[in-house]
C-alpha cells in the first residue's frame, strides 16, 4: 500500500489512523526535504488534490481538516513545492480507515445439518463495520468445562468431530475489530436438538383428470432420522399469501402429497423439514412450479424446471431458490 | 510539554469502589484518544479501555466490562476511571496513556495510580 | 484475543553484544499496528518503536524493529548498559488491544 513508499518527512491522523465514521479529523504533514524549505504543502486523497480546508502551522508542517469524514478508506499522502523543483517531491502517505466498532452480535444458532459432519454457528452481526472485523466463537462444555476457540470472518463450521465434550454445550460470539470489541449471549445447545435433516427435495409434480382435478407432489429426502415433521407451503405464482400443508413423515419411501387445485393456473411449491419436537428446521426447498391443465393430465418432473417468463415455454418453471424473499433458510 | 498527571495511591477495602484521574496539558485533550492499562506486579499490561474525549466513545476490554467506567471532564482536562466492587484481584498500577496522533501509539503514559485493596 | 508471546522472558547481554528479541502474535497483525515499549523498575512503559520498525524520537539508532504477519523482532546491535530494560510488544489491530508477556533485558 502507500504505506511503504520511502518518507522525505511524516504525515499523520488526529485521532488516528482508525476512527469511527463521521468523525472530524485533522490530516498533519511535516516535511523533512534536504535543500527545501517548502513553498506550498500540498495534500492528495485517492490521488486527488485537496484544495480546501489547509492550514499551515509553520514552515514544514500543514493541516488538512475534514469533517464528517465518511469514507471507509482512503489513500492520503503529501508533497512540497521546493524551490528550483520543477515537480512536487512526495513527503510521505498513509492508508486511513473509517469505520464503527461491532454490534452485539445476536441470534446466535448452531445448527447440525444430516450428513454434512458439522456444526454450523452463525449469527446476526449487525451494522456494516466498513473495517475488517472477526468474530471469536466460543464454544464451552458444560460436561468437561474445557473451552475451544474458533476465528472467523463471518460464520464458522465446527467439525463434530471436536466437540469431545459430551453433547450440552454453551456458544456465545465474541465481535472484534480496532474500534472495539462486543460479546453475544450465551447460547446454550444440546447436540441431539440441533440436527436438521438431510434436505427435503420435491422432484415431481402430475395433475391426474378426475371429477375433480386432484395434483400430486413427489417429494423426498435421504434423511435417516425416523420422527420428521414437514412442511409444504404452495401458492398462485400471481398470490402474496402462502398456504401450508403440514405431515407427520416417514421417508423410507417417496412422499406423495394430494393437492386440489384451480385449473390452468400456474403455482409454485417448497417443502421444508424438522425433526419432530426439535427447534430448528430445513430452509425451504427450492422452488418448484407446476401449471395445472385445462383439462388434460400434465406430468412436471424437477428436470424441467426452465423459465417460462424467459424462454416462453407453456408448462414447467425455474426451481432456483432465489425468487422468493423468505427462502433464505427458515431455522429460528 | 505534554503531561498526563494522574492522582495518588489509594487504599480501599474490598467491595468498595476508586475513582481515578488523569489530567492531561501540553496538546488538544479533546483530539485524542485516552487508554488505560492496568499493571499488576510481576505480571504484563492488560488494557482496560480506551475513550474519545471529543465524543465520549468508550471502548472496553470485555474482562473489564462492569469493573471500570471511563469518563472525562473536557472543561478541565481530565480523564477518569472508576473501578467498582474490587478486590484483592484488582490490586494493581493503573495508568492512562494518549493514543494517536504522530505515532499513532500510546506516546504518553501518566505515572501510573497503585491501588492496594485490602481490609 | 490476539496473543503476543514474547520470547526469551528474560535475556542478558554483555556491553556491545548484538541482541533480539521476539514476539509471537496468535494471528496475523497489521505491521502499522505493532509497537514496541521499553519500561524500567518504577516507570510507566515509554514508547520505543512503532509501527513494527520507526523509532520514536529519543531512541537511539542501535534499536531497530522488524517483521510482518505474526513475527516480529527488536534488535539492539550494540548493547549499552542503559538498553536494560523490560521491552514489551503491543497490538492494536484488533480489540482487545494486547500486549506481550515482556523480554527482560538485563546487563550482564
Known amino acids: 500500500g502507500i504505506t511503504n513508499i520511502n518518507c522525505s518527512g511524516h504525515i499523520w491522523v488526529e485521532p488516528a489512523t482508525i476512527f469511527k465514521m463521521g468523525m472530524n479529523i485533522s490530516i498533519y504533514c511535516q516535511a523533512a526535504i534536504k535543500n527545501c524549505q517548502p513553498r506550498k504543502l500540498h495534500f492528495y486523497k485517492n490521488g486527488i488534490k485537496e484544495r480546501f480546508q489547509i492550514t499551515r502551522i509553520n514552515k514544514t508542517t500543514a493541516r488538512l481538516w475534514y469533517k464528517n469524514f465518511l469514507e471507509p478508506h482512503a489513500s492520503m499522502y503529501c508533497t512540497a513545492e521546493c524551490p528550483k523543483h520543477f515537480q512536487e517531491t512526495l513527503i510521505c502517505g498513509k492508508d486511513i480507515s473509517s469505520g464503527y466498532p461491532p454490534d452485539i452480535p445476536d441470534e446466535v444458532t448452531c445448527v447440525i445439518y444430516e450428513y454434512s459432519g458439522n456444526m454450523t454457528c452463525t449469527w446476526n452481526a449487525g451494522k456494516l463495520t466498513y473495517i475488517d472485523t472477526k468474530y471469536v466463537v466460543h464454544v464451552k462444555s458444560l460436561e468437561t468445562e474445557e473451552e475451544q476457540q474458533y476465528l472467523t470472518s463471518s460464520y464458522i463450521n465446527i467439525s463434530t468431530d471436536s466437540l469431545q465434550g459430551g453433547k450440552k454445550y454453551l456458544v456465545w460470539v465474541q465481535a472484534a475489530n480496532a474500534l472495539g470489541m462486543e460479546e453475544s449471549k450465551q447460547l446454550q445447545i444440546h447436540l441431539d436438538d440441533i440436527v436438521i435433516p438431510s434436505a427435503a427435495v420435491i422432484s415431481r409434480a402430475e395433475t391426474i383428470n378426475a371429477t375433480v382435478p386432484k395434483t400430486i407432489i413427489y417429494w423426498d429426502s435421504q434423511t435417516t432420522i425416523e420422527k420428521v415433521s414437514c412442511e409444504m407451503r404452495y401458492k398462485a405464482t400471481t398470490n402474496q399469501t402462502w398456504n401450508v400443508k403440514e405431515f407427520d413423515t416417514n421417508f423410507t419411501y417417496v412422499q406423495q402429497s394430494e393437492f386440489y387445485l384451480e385449473p390452468n393456473i400456474k403455482y409454485v411449491f417448497q417443502v421444508r423439514c424438522q425433526e419432530t419436537g426439535k427447534r430448528y428446521w430445513q430452509p425451504w426447498s427450492s422452488l418448484f412450479f407446476h401449471k395445472t391443465p385445462e383439462t388434460v393430465p400434465q406430468v412436471t418432473s424437477k428436470a424441467f424446471q426452465h423459465d417460462t417468463w424467459n424462454s416462453g415455454l407453456t408448462v414447467a418453471s425455474i426451481s432456483t431458490g432465489h425468487l422468493t424473499s423468505d427462502n433464505r433458510g427458515d431455522i429460528g | 510539554e505534554f503531561q498526563l498527571q494522574q492522582s495518588g495511591p489509594e487504599l480501599v477495602k474490598p467491595g468498595a469502589s476508586v475513582k481515578m484521574s488523569c489530567k492531561a496539558s501540553?496538546?488538544?485533550?479533546?483530539?485524542?484518544?485516552m487508554h488505560w492499562v492496568k499493571q499488576s506486579h510481576g505480571k504484563t499490561i492488560e488494557w482496560i479501555g480506551y475513550i474519545y474525549p471529543n465524543s465520549g466513545d468508550t471502548s472496553y476490554n470485555q474482562k473489564f466490562k462492569g469493573k471500570a467506567t471511563l469518563t472525562v471532564d473536557k472543561s478541565s482536562s481530565t480523564a477518569y476511571m472508576e473501578l467498582r466492587s474490587l478486590t484483592s484481584e484488582d490490586s494493581a498500577v493503573y495508568t492512562c496513556?494518549?493514543?494517536?496522533?504522530?505515532?499513532?501509539?500510546?506516546?504518553?503514559w501518566g505515572q501510573g495510580t497503585t491501588v492496594t485493596v485490602s481490609s | 484475543d490476539i496473543v503476543l508471546t514474547q520470547s526469551p522472558a528474560i535475556m542478558s547481554a554483555s556491553l556491545g553484544e548484538r541482541v533480539t528479541m521476539t514476539c509471537t502474535a496468535s494471528s496475523s497483525v497489521s505491521s502499522s499496528y505493532l509497537h514496541w515499549y521499553q519500561q524500567k523498575p518504577g516507570s510507566s512503559p515509554k514508547l520505543w518503536i512503532y509501527s513494527t520498525s520507526n523509532l520514536a524520537s529519543g531512541v537511539p539508532a542501535r534499536f531497530s524493529g522488524s517483521g510482518s504477519g505474526t513475527s516480529y523482532s527488536l534488535t539492539i546491535s550494540s548493547m549499552e548498559a542503559e538498553d536494560a530494560a523490560t521491552y514489551y510488544c503491543h497490538q492494536y489491530h484488533r480489540s482487545p488491544f494486547t500486549f506481550g508477556s515482556g523480554t527482560k533485558l538485563e546487563m550482564k
Open positions: 496513556a494518549r493514543f494517536g496522533g504522530f505515532y499513532d501509539a500510546m506516546d504518553y
Open positions: 501540553g496538546y488538544t485533550f479533546t483530539n485524542y484518544y
